[in-house]
């Protein structure tokens, strides 16, 4: 690879912990997405919280290592946890620059493959590490 991996960086207010230390933030100004050069992997991640009416980004950044899923060219999220009733956390990993900016698609809540009501529960802001 000719370049270090660069990902979109975002952490929603109230999220506990930070993945900022997994890369070097680029000085992109105010109107552009924040960007981070990954230090320990060539892999980006994204986490979205899907409720009945909308998907809200929770975190975006660099993974701490390359692992299965990182070879994906695009962000194809899969369900990981239920932080609260009626919402589902979806995460993706991918291995191209800024691939975590957007997801290619999200299955509707409750669709096959989404964890059932017995899935892991977590308080807001505490679910992120489970998803990672």
């Amino acid at each position: 690879p000719p370049n270090r991996r660069t990902c979109v960086f975002f952490e929603a207010p109230g999220v506990r912990g930070s993945t900022k230390t997994l890369g070097e933030l680029l000085d992109t100004g105010t109107e552009l997405p924040r960007a981070i050069r990954c230090l320990y992997s060539r892999c980006c991640f994204g986490i979205w919280n899907l409720t009945q009416d909308r998907a809200q980004v929770e975190m975006q950044g660099c993974r701490d290592s390359d692992e299965p899923g990182c070879e994906s060219l695009h962000c194809d999220p899969s369900p990981r946890a239920h932080p609260s009733p009626g919402s589902t956390l979806f995460t993706c990993s991918c291995g191209t620059d800024f691939c975590n900016a957007n997801y290619s698609h999200l299955p509707p809540p409750g669709s096959p493959g989404t964890p059932g009501s017995q899935g892991p529960q977590a308080a807001p802001g505490e679910s992120i590490w489970m998803a990672l």
Epitope: P1, P2, N3, R4, E24, L26, L32, F98
Partner: antibody, heavy 113, light 112 residues
Framework: QVQLVQSGAEVVKPGASVKVSCKAS????????VSWVRQAPGQGLEWIGE????????NFNEKFKGRVTMTVDTSTSTAYMELRSLRSDDTAVYYC??????WGQGTLVTVSS | DVVMTQSPLSLPVTLGQPASISCRSS???????????LEWFQQRPGQSPRRLIY???NRFSGVPDRFSGSGSGTDFTLKISRVEAEDVGVYYC?????????FGQGTKLEIK
Amino acid sequence: QVQLVQSGAEVVKPGASVKVSCKASGYTFTDYWVSWVRQAPGQGLEWIGEIYPKNGVSNFNEKFKGRVTMTVDTSTSTAYMELRSLRSDDTAVYYCTRQRDYWGQGTLVTVSS
Amino acid sequence: DVVMTQSPLSLPVTLGQPASISCRSSQSLEYGDGYTYLEWFQQRPGQSPRRLIYGVSNRFSGVPDRFSGSGSGTDFTLKISRVEAEDVGVYYCFQATHDPNTFGQGTKLEIK
């Protein structure tokens, strides 16, 4: 095939600005970083910075910060590099390159009063 | 900034003979992701630079196999197994591990 075609030579006065263009073809413009490199007459190569066309994120050599602006027009697959407050030691051939694997032919910028 | 020091700066070679260029960096070029972002470029007289090698030892497409790269950490080498007339020009090493990216000062290869 991948091609990067740059604008023609420029002669500019000290203190003025110059904007060099780089038109890309033969690949998906938004999928690769465009870097800018310069070479003063008889000298080596110097990295100026890079821009990712899909979102406009750029990364600069601190030496040029405040004087250089990199932009893109994705509708025409063209990258631009503007250098301001030009001095005589900015006289150089300026190259654009697609992640350093394919290079433009270079644009000679001469700063002279 | 990371300083890239090449040697020799001038390299007279007989056609058909091997040639070797050394490049030493002031800091390790191995990045935290396990990759080493070290490249070699050739610039023939009057032409734009051309990438020969990336990632220390990977030949770019279309580059003859007489060119090879090796090294790790701070010490790197470009070798030409048998020099041909078309190899005349200036060779640069380049690092993209640290910002700002930096080039070596260049090695001028000429035919004896």
